[in-house]
């Protein structure tokens, strides 16, 4: 059997670190057998069999010029084997970042904090952390570990499915190469990393007869669970074309009527989403949608009711541990005073 331990990586390759002493091992001889060493394709003897180093070649303070293929020969001139030297660095702790687009799953991505220059793989796992006692800050030995399944196509990402919203998790990402391993532990809670995808299907429509109004409507992001226990709230921004500043409102549901649009000008509108009880952060903005207020005349009859805004049927009870979430259904609301003023202005 070969006296050379096979490091993780392709066969026939041995590894070292720049600036350090490197030992190469002749694979096809018995441990301790004296051998001669040559660079592949070069007749010059690098180290003879009388070196006292047996089957090993020592390179002091290796640098990039030492990389390449080496040949070892036994005393009778037989080929002891060929060895390729590759230089690089041991792993440094990888950088890990986790995010959740919904309240049931989260994903973690990682990146090396230094490129080692060597074949590298990553081991990914997680534990669920549990708190000891209501008042205790101390955490119990956690449950797990379980593997965090990695994306199949080599993307540096793994996904935890079926996570618990109120639990804390410890993610372990270990970078492994032939010179060692290094681990990053990251504590995450779904509440803090939750960032929904932006709302979808944003539409902006004029309101016939109201030259200062636009109705915007949108839907939940497709990634948000279909029957949500946790609802989203929204932030809407709008601005007339060529106007640098956005106006911001927080609609109460899945639509909003803008009542101070600039007559005759197209307006850009975008929406963002966040967990209704402010867990995590706001989503990125949706792609902008455009609309121009109506230039037509007002209808003969002004409706007494209009679905100009939406609001929850139930107010969230922030002090309860698992608060009820509001209904998704819009609720009609009386026109407010501002609307009446606008109607008078239009009629005049």
């Amino acid at each position: 059997s070969s006296p050379c331990p096979q490091a993780w990586g392709p066969p026939g390759v041995q590894y070292g670190q720049p600036g350090r002493s490197v030992k190469l091992c002749c694979p096809g001889v018995t441990a301790g057998d004296p051998v001669s060493w040559f660079r592949d394709g070069e007749p010059k003897l690098l180290q003879g069999p009388d070196s006292g180093l047996g089957h090993e070649l020592v390179l002091a303070q290796a640098d990039s010029t030492d990389e390449g293929t080496y040949i070892c020969q036994t005393l009778d001139g037989a080929l002891g084997g060929t060895v390729t030297l590759q230089l690089g660095y041991p792993p440094a702790r990888p950088v890990v970042s986790c995010q959740a687009a919904d309240y049931e799953n989260f994903s973690c991505t990682w990146s090396p904090s230094q490129i080692s220059g060597l074949p590298t793989r990553y081991l990914t796992s997680y534990r669920k952390k549990t708190v000891l006692g209501a008042d205790s800050q101390r955490r119990s030995p956690s449950t797990g570990p379980w593997p965090c399944p990695q994306d199949p196509l080599g993307a540096a990402r793994c996904v935890v499915h079926g996570a618990e919203f109120w639990s804390q998790y410890r993610i372990n990402v270990t970078e492994v190469n032939p010179l060692g391993a290094s681990t990053r532990l990251l504590d995450v809670s779904l509440q803090s990393i939750l960032r929904p995808d932006p709302p979808q299907g944003l539409r902006v429509e004029s309101v016939p007869g109201y030259p200062r109004r636009l109705r915007a409507s949108w839907t939940y992001p497709a990634s948000w669970p279909c029957q949500p226990h946790f609802l989203l709230k929204f932030r809407l921004q709008y601005r007339p074309a060529q106007h640098p500043a956005w106006s911001t409102v927080e609609p109460a549901g899945l639509e909003e009527v803008i009542t101070d649009a600039v007559a005759g000008l197209p307006h850009a509108v975008r929406v963002s989403a966040r967990d209704f009880l402010d867990a995590g952060t706001w989503s990125t903005w949706s792609p902008e949608a455009w609309g121009t207020p109506s230039t037509g005349t007002i209808p003969k009859e002004i409706p007494a009711w209009g679905q100009l805004h939406t609001q929850p049927e139930v107010e969230p009870q922030v002090d309860s541990p698992a608060p009820p979430r509001p209904s998704l259904q819009p609720h009609p609301r009386l026109l407010d005073h501002r609307d009446s003023v606008e109607q008078v202005a239009v009629l005049a």
């Epitope: 440094a92 950088v95 890990v96 904090s113 230094q114 490129i115 220059g117």
Partner: antibody
Framework: EVQLLESGGGLVQPGGSLRLSCAAS????????MGWVRQAPGKGLEWVSS????????IYADSVKGRFTISRDNSKNTLYLQMNSLRAEDTAVYYC???????????WGQGTLVTVSS | DIQMTQSPSSLSASVGDRVTITCQAS??????LNWYLHKPGKAPKLLIY???NLQTGVPSRFSGSGSGTDFTFTITSLQPEDFGTYYC?????????FGPGTTVDIK
């Protein structure tokens, strides 16, 4: 020899923007994590932001999150810090730093002064 | 985020004196701790990494020890070029943080 040279500092009004650059030499820039650290007048050192070798993950101090953006151009061996919505408390000397073997900020530039004042 | 505290905040010492600075982390940072010397108008210089390892080229009169939350930095015989502000810094987390600094000046 590792060399880091910051530029782009200067006087800017509150709410304004500035982009700092850090030109790196003496090492293979694309292999290393890089970052920015600042020191306000009469104060201590404060880590600002870091970026992995590929640029794929960026990390920010809470004090600058949403206002500052770190980026890098590995083909130009240059690190950047785009600073928007600047405030008086962002006034500081900004240092570019290199991480090595997982050790944060082993090598530093000489710094560039950013003054935010009306 | 992890808070770092340092003591003393300043000290006066003479050339040849033994100087000790302590640094405490608000939670366990294993040995992910650096010590720097910063002089006005200059770049900070890394002296000690991983709590106790001497950075290449740094004189052996500097040393560091500790793990977990409590760390110590020592200069066995203070030299004229050692005056300045010393900072500890944790890098256990992805959000590194510095101690407030210890200014060492001439007595």
């Amino acid at each position: 020899e590792v060399q880091l040279l910051e530029s782009g500092g200067g006087l800017v009004q509150p709410g304004g923007s500035l982009r700092l650059s850090c030109a790196a030499s003496g090492f293979t820039f694309s292999r290393y994590m890089m970052g920015w650290v600042r020191q306000a007048p009469g104060k201590g050192l404060e880590w600002v932001s870091s970026i992995v070798p590929s640029g794929g993950i960026t990390i920010y101090a809470d004090s600058v999150k949403g206002r500052f953006t770190i980026s890098r151009d590995n083909s130009k061996n240059t690190l950047y810090l785009q600073m928007n919505s600047l405030r008086a408390e962002d006034t500081a000397v900004y240092y570019c730093a290199r991480d090595h073997m997982g050790i944060v900020a082993t090598d530093w530039g000489q710094g560039t002064l950013v003054t935010v004042s009306s | 985020d992890i808070q770092m505290t340092q003591s003393p905040s300043s000290l006066s010492a003479s050339v040849g004196d033994r100087v000790t600075i302590t640094c405490q982390a608000s939670q366990d940072i294993t040995n992910y701790l650096n010590w720097y010397l910063h002089k006005p108008g200059k770049a900070p210089k890394l002296l000690i990494y991983d709590a106790s390892n001497l950075q290449t080229g740094v004189p052996s009169r500097f040393s560091g020890s500790g793990s977990g939350t409590d760390f110590t930095f020592t200069i066995t015989s203070l030299q004229p070029e050692d005056f300045g502000t010393y900072y500890c810094q944790q890098y256990d987390t992805l959000h590194p943080s510095f101690g407030p600094g210890t200014t060492v000046d001439i007595k």
